[in-house]
């Protein structure tokens, strides 16, 4: 199930500046992102910005700058004109629409005890998806087997045995870091980062994101829309998400150049994947 995370932070240099970061984790392509404050989109919230992956962005005061950070995450800078900093107690919501599959929305606010500039993402939680856990388990078994073989070889040193040549797999490493999204109902979490190194391409996961980001879900509000939408129980615990970084893809903070309809925007481990162009009314 696709999920959304939200993080709100106050800028260290300007106490009146806030930044909202939102991200989408899951399969499917994003057709529109809506950022609102004061509540969810369509439930009393006021829209601050709308971002389209191809056509650009639209924003309304007090939004200062809305931009794509990666293929599946955005940031919105806000300028607080008032001295009382109303943003500090405001809920910000991000809605990722994938037409016609569905839309997913999650909300967050500035942590109550956050010092300026120190509102980094909450402490990560080491939670793995079931398929990754299975792979790690298998890796453990293989490692144990290798260790056992080495043990046997050491025991039989007196016998002339051919030296085993280790095979080196030159495949990319997948690093997954689990973070907790900023949500109003979220309690503080105090666990170290969970780092996973495997030797397979993330696109080979059964629910890999078309952009190459593996879908490692987080808890968020899911509003299924359209016949293709189906809700399933997230495997991860409530309030956690995992971002997958991969060297094949565009560097964080960059956005791939607009290539137009029908061209490959994002690389895929299995080879080029055509991204459907915009379907405008002309």
């Amino acid at each position: 199930t696709p999920e959304v995370w939200v993080q709100v932070q106050m800028e260290a240099t300007e106490l009146s500046s806030f930044t909202v970061h939102c991200g989408f984790l899951g399969p499917g392509s994003i057709s529109l992102v809506t950022v609102s404050w004061g509540g969810p989109d369509g439930a009393g919230g006021t829209k601050l910005a709308v971002l389209h992956p191809e056509l650009g962005t639209r924003q309304w005061a007090p939004a200062r700058q809305a931009r794509w950070e990666t293929q599946s995450s955005i940031s919105l800078a806000l300028e607080d004109s008032g001295a009382s900093s109303p943003f500090a107690n405001t809920t910000f919501c991000c809605k990722f629409a994938s037409f016609p599959e569905g839309s997913w929305e999650s909300c967050g606010s500035l942590p109550p005890s956050s010092d300026p500039g120190l509102s980094a993402p909450p402490t990560p939680v080491p939670i793995l998806r079931a398929d990754l856990a299975g792979i790690l388990g298998l890796s453990g078994v293989l490692l144990f087997g290798c260790g056992y073989l080495l043990h046997l070889l050491r025991r039989q040193k007196h016998r002339p045995t051919p030296r085993l040549q280790p095979s080196h797999t030159n495949s990319q490493a997948l690093t997954a870091q689990a973070w907790a999204p900023s949500q109003a109902s979220q309690a503080a979490l105090h666990d170290p980062y969970a780092t996973i190194n495997t030797s397979f391409c993330p696109a080979t996961l059964d629910t890999a994101h078309p952009n190459g980001w593996a879908s490692l879900p987080t808890h968020a509000a899911h509003q299924p829309q359209g016949p293709a939408a189906s809700a399933s129980t997230p495997i991860l615990a409530r309030g956690s998400f995992v971002s997958v970084e991969n060297g094949l893809y565009t560097q964080a903070g960059e956005r791939p150049p607009h290539t137009g309809p029908g061209l490959t925007l994002f690389p895929d481990c299995r080879g080029p994947r055509a991204v459907e162009g915009r379907f405008g009314v002309r």
């Epitope: 369509g42 056509l55 037409f99």
Partner: nanobody, 121 residues
């Protein structure tokens, strides 16, 4: 919460007519277009028609002169009158509410479950 419910789909013979309706509720500020998209079996999505906040209708070339989009603000409803239907008009039709990034495109932010239109003899 924004809710869009389409109705009026069904089976019709080539050359026939159908009128699709969309009942909308839960609107918020800063939504500036309403329209219809369709998805034919095994094909991609296509914007059929939309109305801007200023009431100007826009159509995809393939339906110009055959389809008419209209809205009733008092009833919070959107309509699509489809005449001279062809087999290639067979699709699931979605009512959408969205945002304009240029004149020709209403980017969907909310949509309904869709209603099936089948044109066949």
């Amino acid at each position: 919460e924004v809710q869009l419910v389409e109705s009026g789909g069904g089976l019709v013979q080539p050359g026939g007519s159908l009128r699709l309706s969309c009942a909308a509720s839960g609107f918020t500020s800063r939504t500036d277009c309403m329209g219809w998209f369709r998805q034919a079996p095994g094909k991609g999505l296509e914007g059929v028609a939309h109305i801007d906040s200023d009431g100007i209708p826009r159509y995809v070339d393939s339906v110009k002169g055959r389809f008419t989009i209209s809205r009733d603000n008092a009833k919070n409803s959107l309509y699509l009158q489809m005449n001279s239907l062809r087999a290639e008009d067979t699709a699931v039709y979605y009512c959408v509410v969205g945002f304009k990034f240029d004149e020709d495109y209403c980017a969907p932010n909310d949509w309904g479950q869709g209603t099936m239109v089948t044109v066949s003899s």
